[in-house]
Interface confidence: low
C-alpha cells in the first residue's frame, strides 16, 4: 500500500519514542565514530521534520524516500571526510548507490574504546538525573559497536536495561541487584549481535535463497505441526524483515516485525501450541519470545520421507515443475522430523538431494539413479555427530579454559596469519560450545553445537574480510555457507607458514596483570599461547603445556611477591630463557 509520505507513515505506525530510538540506532550504525551529541541533534531534526509530514503529508520533501532523507541528513555532518575518509565519497552518489556505499563502510571492529562500567552509584545518579539521555547513550554505544545489531531487538534490550535501573537503583544493595542483570544483558547482547551478523552475512554474501533455506529449516523444526504453506508464508515475511534490517531500513524492519508477530499470534492455532505465553506479552517481549520459542512437539505418525522423495515415480516431474518449491518441501519435511539435527546439516542434506536430482533427472533411468540418495546422507550426519562426541569428551576432560587453549593451538596452527586478538576472541567463543552444549542429551547436542559454531565462525569470517591475510580463511568463508565448519575442521597445519621471529617484548609481563579479573588474566595467557604457537608452529602439545604451566606458576608467584614489578622483571627473563630452551627457539 503506497503512502504519500513514507516518513509520516512510519512515524505514525511506530510512535515517537520508537521512531527516535530507531533513527538513532540507524545513524550510530552508519557513522560509528560520531559523538553522541551530534547524533542526538540529527535525530531531533529528523523527528521534527517527520512531525511536519504527519501534520501535512503533502508538505515539502515529505514524499522523499527514507534513504534519501536519512542520507541527506548524514551527509550534513561537517567532519565527514576527516573522520571517515573515503566514506565521505558516498555523499557524491545518488540513491540507492549512496545507501549501498554507507553499508559497505560499516565496520565490524571499529576502533572504539572498550566500554568500562562506572560505579553503580554513578550509573544510578546518571539514570535519575536524565533517564532519557542515559537510555539513548545505551542505544548509541551498542549500535556503534555492533553495526548489524537487530534494531527492534535492541529496543527490547533497552527496555530491560531501563527496567534493571528502575528496580535496582531503589534496592538496598544496588550493586548486588544491578550487576548480574547488566552482565546478563551484556552476554545476551553479544550473542544476539553475533546471531544477527550471521543472518546479514547470509543475505549479503550468499543471497536471499540461502537465507530462505535456513529459515525453512529452522521454522520447520520449531513449528513441525504447521503446514508447508504456512511455513512458506512465515519464511517470506521473516526474510523481508531481516533484509530490511540488514540493509539499514530499520523503521520498515521494526514495523514489519511487529506485523509478523501479530500475524503469528492471530494464527497460532495453525502454527504452534507453544506460542500462547509469548502472545500474551507486550510487543517487544512478544517478538523476542516468538524468536526464542521452543520447538513444538512433532506430529504423531509422520509418514516415511522416502515415499514422496525417492520411491515416487513423479520425483523428477515434481522437481522440474518447481525446483525451489519441491526442494523447500523436502527441507520442510526433513527438518520437521529432525529437531535433533543442526540447521546447517539439514541444508547440506538438501543440497546433496538437489545435486542428485540435477544429475539423475537427466539420466536414462532417473529412479534407478536416485534410489539410493538417502544412503548418501549417512556420512554427512555422522561427521558432525562424531566431531561433537570427540570434542565434548575433550571438554569434559579439560574444562572450559583448557579446552579453549586446545582450540587456540588448533586454530593458530590452521591459520597462523590471522591476528592474535581475532584468534583469541574466536577460539574463546568456540570453546564456549562445551559448557553451552555438551551437557545435553544426544538429541539436543547437534543443533546446539553446530549452529552455535556457525555463528562463531561467521565472526572470524567478517573480521578476516576487513583485513584478509589468509587464503585458507577466505576459501572456507566464501565457498559455502553451510560447509564453513566442515571446511575449517578439515584444515591441517599450514605448512607454508614461516614462523614469526621471537620477540621477548611479547612475553614481558608487569604487575598490572595481578589486578585483572580472572577473565582478563586468561585472555593475557591465551594471547601469549597464540604468540608461542606462531613462533613455534611445530611445538608439541606437551611442550606448550609445560611452558604454559611454567607461565601460570610465574604469574602466581610474582603476584604474591612483595616487590611485584621486580619479580616480573627478573623471573620473566628466566621464564623467557627457559621457554626458548624448551621449545628450541
Amino acid at each position: 500500500d503506497a503512502h504519500k509520505s513514507e516518513v509520516a507513515h512510519r512515524f505514525k505506525d511506530l510512535g515517537e519514542e520508537n521512531f527516535k530510538a530507531l533513527v538513532l540506532i540507524a545513524f550510530a550504525q552508519y557513522l560509528q565514530q560520531c559523538p553522541f551529541e551530534d547524533h542526538v541533534k540529527l535525530v531531533n531534526e529528523v523527528t521534527e521534520f517527520a512531525k511536519t509530514c504527519v501534520a501535512d503529508e503533502s508538505a515539502e520533501n515529505c514524499d522523499k524516500s527514507l534513504h534519501t532523507l536519512f542520507g541527506d541528513k548524514l551527509c550534513t555532518v561537517a567532519t565527514l571526510r576527516e573522520t571517515y575518509g573515503e566514506m565521505a565519497d558516498c555523499c557524491a552518489k545518488q540513491e540507492p548507490e549512496r545507501n549501498e556505499c554507507f553499508l559497505q563502510h560499516k565496520d565490524d571492529n571499529p576502533n572504539l574504546p572498550r566500554l568500562v562500567r562506572p560505579e553503580v552509584d554513578v550509573m544510578c545518579t546518571a539514570f535519575h538525573d536524565n533517564e532519557e539521555t542515559f537510555l539513548k547513550k545505551y542505544l548509541y554505544e551498542i549500535a556503534r559497536r555492533h553495526p548489524y545489531f537487530y534494531a527492534p531487538e535492541l529496543l527490547f534490550f533497552a527496555k530491560r536495561y531501563k527496567a534493571a535501573f528502575t528496580e535496582c537503583c531503589q534496592a538496598a544493595d544496588k550493586a548486588a541487584c544491578l550487576l548480574p542483570k547488566l552482565d546478563e544483558l551484556r552476554d545476551e547482547g553479544k550473542a544476539s549481535s553475533a546471531k544477527q551478523r550471521l543472518k546479514c552475512a547470509s543475505l549479503q554474501k550468499f543471497g536471499e535463497r540461502a537465507f530462505k533455506a535456513w529459515a525453512v529449516a529452522r521454522l520447520s523444526q520449531r513449528f513441525p505441526k504447521a503446514e508447508f504453506a504456512e511455513v512458506s508464508k512465515l519464511v517470506t515475511d521473516l526474510t523481508k524483515v531481516h533484509t530490511e534490517c540488514c540493509h539499514g531500513d530499520l523503521l520498515e524492519c521494526a514495523d514489519d516485525r511487529a506485523d509478523l508477530a501479530k500475524y503469528i499470534c492471530e494464527n497460532q492455532d495453525s502454527i504452534s501450541s507453544k506460542l500462547k505465553e509469548c502472545c500474551e506479552k507486550p510487543l517487544l517481549e512478544k517478538s523476542h519470545c516468538i524468536a526464542e520459542v521452543e520447538n513444538d512437539e512433532m506430529p504423531a505418525d509422520l509418514p516415511s520421507l522416502a515415499a514422496d522423495f525417492v520411491e515416487s515415480k513423479d520425483v523428477c516431474k515434481n522437481y522440474a515443475e518447481a525446483k525451489d518449491v519441491f526442494l523447500g518441501m523436502f527441507l520442510y519435511e526433513y527438518a520437521r522430523r529432525h529437531p535433533d539435527y543442526s540447521v546447517v546439516l539439514l541444508l547440506r542434506l538438501a543440497k546433496t538431494y538437489e545435486t542428485t536430482l540435477e544429475k539423475c533427472c537427466a539420466a536414462a533411468d532417473p529412479h534407478e539413479c536416485y534410489a539410493k540418495v538417502f544412503d548418501e546422507f549417512k556420512p554427512l550426519v555422522e561427521e558432525p555427530q562424531n566431531l561433537i562426541k570427540q570434542n565434548c569428551e575433550l571438554f569434559e576432560q579439560l574444562g572450559e579454559y583448557k579446552f579453549q587453549n586446545a582450540l587456540l593451538v588448533r586454530y593458530t596452527k590452521k591459520v597462523p596469519q590471522v591476528s592474535t586478538p581475532t584468534l583469541v576472541e574466536v577460539s574463546r567463543n568456540l570453546g564456549k560450545v562445551g559448557s553451552k552444549c555438551c551437557k545435553h542429551p544426544e538429541a539436543k547436542r547437534m543443533p546446539c553445537a553446530e549452529d552455535y559454531l556457525s555463528v562463531v565462525l561467521n565472526q572470524l569470517c567478517v573480521l578476516h574480510e576487513k583485513t584478509p591475510v589468509s587464503d585458507r580463511v577466505t576459501k572456507c568463508c566464501t565457498e559455502s555457507l553451510v560447509n564453513r565448519r566442515p571446511c575449517f575442521s578439515a584444515l591441517e597445519v599450514d605448512e607454508t607458514y614461516v614462523p614469526k621471529e621471537f620477540n621477548a617484548e611479547t612475553f614481558t609481563f608487569h604487575a598490572d596483570i595481578c589486578t585483572l579479573s580472572e577473565k582478563e588474566r586468561q585472555i593475557k595467557k591465551q594471547t601469549a599461547l597464540v604468540e608461542l604457537v606462531k613462533h613455534k608452529p611445530k611445538a608439541t602439545k606437551e611442550q606448550l603445556k609445560a611452558v604454559m604451566d611454567d607461565f601460570a606458576a610465574f604469574v602466581e608467584k610474582c603476584c604474591k611477591a612483595d616487590d611485584k614489578e621486580t619479580c616480573f622483571a627478573e623471573e620473566g627473563k628466566k621464564l623467557v630463557a627457559a621457554s626458548q630452551a624448551a621449545l628450541g627457539l
Epitope: K181, D183, E188, S192, E294, H440
Partner: nanobody
C-alpha cells in the same frame, strides 16, 4: 564450578504436596538463572520451571502451572520447588539446573550446571 544438591523428594499420595530444595555452592548464586527439570522413567528430560536471577521472572511448563511454585533465596544460595496437587504422572527424577546466561529458560541445553536429581514418586 557450581555444585548443585537437590533434596526433599520422596513418596507421596495423589493430591499431596512436597517441597524440593536445591542448594548451590561454588559460584555467585545470584548471577544464575535457576531451573527445575524432570525425567520420568523411559522418557526424555522435560522442563518444569525456571526463575530469573532476582525472582522477577518465573516460567512454568503448562502441565504444572497453578500446581507448582518456584522460588529462590539468594541469601541462602537455594532454589525451591513447591509441588502441590501431585498426580501420578508427576512421578520422575527432578533435577535442579543453573544457567549463567540464557535467552530461553525452557531449553535444557542453555543450562550449564546440573544436580544429581531427587526422586518424586506419586502413588496410592
Amino acid at each position: 564450578e557450581v555444585q548443585l544438591v537437590e533434596s526433599g523428594g520422596g513418596v507421596v499420595q495423589p493430591g499431596g504436596s512436597l517441597r524440593l530444595s536445591c542448594a548451590a555452592s561454588g559460584g555467585t548464586f545470584s548471577t544464575y538463572v535457576m531451573g527445575w527439570f524432570r525425567q520420568a522413567p523411559g522418557k526424555e528430560r522435560e522442563f518444569v520451571a525456571a526463575i530469573s536471577q532476582n525472582s522477577i521472572h518465573t516460567y512454568y511448563a503448562d502441565s504444572v502451572k497453578g500446581r507448582f511454585t518456584i522460588s529462590r533465596d539468594n541469601s541462602k544460595n537455594t532454589v525451591y520447588l513447591q509441588l502441590n496437587s501431585l498426580r501420578p504422572e508427576d512421578t520422575a527424577l527432578y533435577y535442579c539446573a543453573a544457567s549463567r546466561f540464557t535467552s530461553w529458560y525452557t531449553a535444557d541445553y542453555e543450562y550449564d550446571y546440573w544436580g544429581q536429581g531427587t526422586l518424586v514418586t506419586v502413588s496410592s
